[in-house]
């Protein structure tokens, strides 16, 4: 009896794993084996596919074959017993095009109100993604184990921190990778669950801000309790995309180690030009807080985005504010070569109720003021560029009294 060729051959490629599956054509014939050949583009001869010779099952793995993943290949299969079937040719394919991204590896670290997620490709030193390893982005689905209500988070990098969670609560999540450059979406990782810890008696420091004074950076933050020590760490922001890089390591700012105030001053030359992440941790000697939320710190903008300088012309029912370029040390104005938007906060000196105006113009009217009343004003600048979303610190407050009621404009 003539052996029939196997049919319906499927090629599954996940990362560097190449799997072939096929259907037997004749289930009634026993002791049949199957063998594959392959042919590279531009070649006439067929080569035996190692790992897929004389296979008794309907599945084989040819991952050991060192292929150029960008080069088209063709496969053929036949059945063998005493005689052999005719060859069945599989449509040619390019491994890279056919490949799926496998499930990433996930490592979780729990805080009381946050989870740190470390993601790395499932296949280390993958040949398939060798040119795209740094282009992976990830998305995740997270849910509270007790409720199952899912939240999706897209376009995250190899390290991501989810905040505003509840203490002592189990959260579950799964992660998948994507290569947007190649329109590839990967397979989800297994579900990972972790329980957030009991609430830390020491909250993390908050409202971290960087400003420039003379040739120094001044880093300030808020903290709930007194008599604490703080440490500050920094990281190159680009490394967040690639924790596999051996440079990925939070480092101490030497002048900000074990400081006893809620600020520290360090020379500008500590950082070369670039974008950094900063974080702060508090300790009372016995206990340690979790790390603060990280702030992005761009030396280029930070060096120039100083608080605006302004003059106030007082009328009976309004202030006219004229915003000028901030002064550097030496009283030279700073040239801002990117568009700014100004946030002006004002309040009655005897009250805490603040009002806010946001303006692109450098001359601003603050309306609806009461005559003969002291008002205070402070201002800060924001960049309008979304990519460089940065704010200066607020200027010092300037307080002025409005004129009597009948002042003409």
């Amino acid at each position: 009896k003539n052996l029939k060729s196997p049919q319906k051959v499927e090629v599954d490629i996940i990362d560097d794993n190449f799997i072939l599956r096929w259907n037997r054509s004749d289930e009634s014939v026993g002791n049949v084996t199957f063998s594959f050949d392959y042919q590279k583009t531009g070649m006439d001869n067929w080569i035996k596919l190692s790992g897929c010779q004389n296979i008794t099952s309907t599945k084989c793995n040819f991952s050991s074959l060192k292929l150029n993943v960008y080069e088209e290949i063709k496969l053929r299969i036949r059945a063998e017993k005493e005689n052999t079937s005719s060859w069945y040719e599989v449509d040619s394919f390019t491994p890279f095009r056919k490949a799926q991204i496998g499930p990433p590896e996930v490592h979780l670290e729990a805080e009381d109100k946050a989870i740190v997620i470390h993601i790395s490709p499932g296949t280390k030193d993958s040949v398939m993604w060798a040119l795209d390893g740094l282009s992976f982005t990830y998305s995740l689905v997270i849910w509270k184990n007790s409720s199952g209500v899912e939240e999706r988070i897209e376009n995250i990098y190899s390290r991501h921190k989810i905040y505003k969670l509840s203490p002592e609560t189990t959260y579950c999540l799964k992660v998948k990778a994507a290569l947007l450059t190649s329109w590839k979406i990967g397979v989800y990782s297994p579900v990972h669950c972790i329980k957030t810890t009991v609430e830390n008696e020491l909250p993390p420091p908050e409202n971290i801000e960087v400003s420039v004074q003379n040739q120094n950076y001044v880093l300030k933050w808020d903290y709930t309790y007194a008599n604490m020590t703080f440490q500050v760490q920094w990281l190159h922001a680009f490394l967040k995309r690639n924790p596999g890089n051996h440079l990925y390591k939070w480092k101490q700012i030497p002048d900000c180690e074990n400081v006893k105030t809620t600020q520290c001053v360090f020379p500008q030359n500590v950082f070369q030009k670039g974008i950094y992440l900063l974080r702060v941790q508090a300790s009372d000697g016995n206990n340690t807080s979790f790390w603060s939320e990280e702030i992005k710190f761009d030396t280029e903008i930070q060096a120039f985005l100083l608080p605006p300088v302004f003059n106030i012309r007082s009328l009976s029912d309004s202030f006219h504010i004229y915003i000028g370029a901030p002064k550097q040390s030496g009283n030279t104005p700073v040239i801002q070569d990117y568009p700014l938007i100004y946030e002006i906060i004002f309040w009655e000196n005897t009250s805490n109720a603040e009002r806010k105006i946001i303006e692109k113009k450098t001359d601003v009217t603050v309306p609806n003021l009461k005559p003969l009343t002291v008002y205070c004003v402070k201002a800060r600048a924001h960049t309008m560029d979304e990519k460089l979303n940065k704010s200066s610190v607020f200027s010092d407050a300037v307080c002025e009294k409005t004129k009597p009621g009948n002042t003409s404009k």
């Epitope: 670290e109 470390h118 329980k195 009991v198 008696e201 051996h246 440079l247 390591k249 340690t288």
Partner: antibody, heavy 123, light 107 residues
Framework: QVQLVQSGAEVKKPGASVKVSCKAS????????MNWVRQRPGQGLEWIGK????????HFNQKFRDRVTLTVDKSTSTVYMELSSLRSEDTAVYYC????????????????WGQGTLVTVSS | DIQMTQSPSSLSASVGDRVTITCKSS??????LAWYQQKPGNAPKLLIS???TLESGVPSRFSGSGSGKDYTLTISSLQPEDFATYYC?????????FGQGTKLEIK
């Protein structure tokens, strides 16, 4: 697979120094902290310190700070622990143990251990 | 330094028994707790990290629980190969510290 292979047993006189090596294989050596732990005869475990093989940053148990030196040879993926001014109470098995990834935000458990090196201090 | 107090210091049990070992820390350690098993002449072996996460290859009869300052290792049904000394360790604050150990012996 991950392996940590330590140097052989040592006998030293009081006041001398000992240098124990720990050769790592099966993982990216510079991506994980390497810790040292000791165990005195019939006693529990005591953490000595740890080193980052990528840049040699160290952290020590205050108790050992003045007498212990941790070093790295990246070319051979080997970490060394040297203990000076030895006394009889330093007689112990010394273990190297892999800690967490350097990129982690917080410290991690010690997941792989060397086989241990017995250091005997005796006059 | 954070003190780790393990109890009991020794325990006699039979194959098939359910066994519980507890570990108390002098400060809150936020689940940064590991359990190790050590057999005579061998290095410790990590069983559980993060207070509850079973390491790969460790039998499911081992489980960890607890939070804050109080943590527990449970062996649901003792097997002959489980007779050993067990240590807890905190890795929340440096210096990392270990419990004094619990020796699990055959009754």
């Amino acid at each position: 697979q991950v392996q940590l292979v330590q140097s052989g047993a040592e006998v030293k006189k009081p006041g001398a120094s000992v240098k124990v090596s720990c050769k790592a294989s099966g993982y990216t050596f510079t991506s994980y902290w390497m810790n040292w732990v000791r165990q005195r005869p019939g006693q529990g475990l005591e953490w000595i310190g740890k080193i980052d093989p990528s840049d040699s940053e160290t952290h020590f148990n205050q108790k050992f700070r003045d007498r212990v030196t941790l070093t790295v040879d990246k070319s051979t993926s080997t970490v060394y622990m040297e203990l000076s001014s030895l006394r009889s109470e330093d007689t112990a098995v010394y273990y190297c143990a892999r800690g967490g990834r350097i990129s982690f935000d917080y410290d991690a458990a010690l997941d792989y251990w060397g086989q241990g090196t017995l250091v005997t201090v005796s006059s | 330094d954070i003190q780790m107090t393990q109890s009991p210091s020794s325990l006699s049990a039979s194959v098939g028994d359910r066994v519980t070992i507890t570990c108390k820390s002098s400060e809150v350690i936020y689940n940064r707790l590991a359990w190790y098993q050590q057999k005579p002449g061998n290095a410790p072996k990590l069983l559980i990290s993060g207070a509850t996460t079973l390491e790969s290859g460790v039998p499911s009869r081992f489980s960890g629980s607890g939070s804050g300052k109080d943590y527990t290792l449970t062996i649901s049904s003792l097997q002959p190969e489980d007779f050993a000394t067990y240590y807890c360790q905190q890795y929340w604050n440096k210096p990392f510290t270990f419990g004094q150990g619990t020796k699990l012996e055959i009754k």
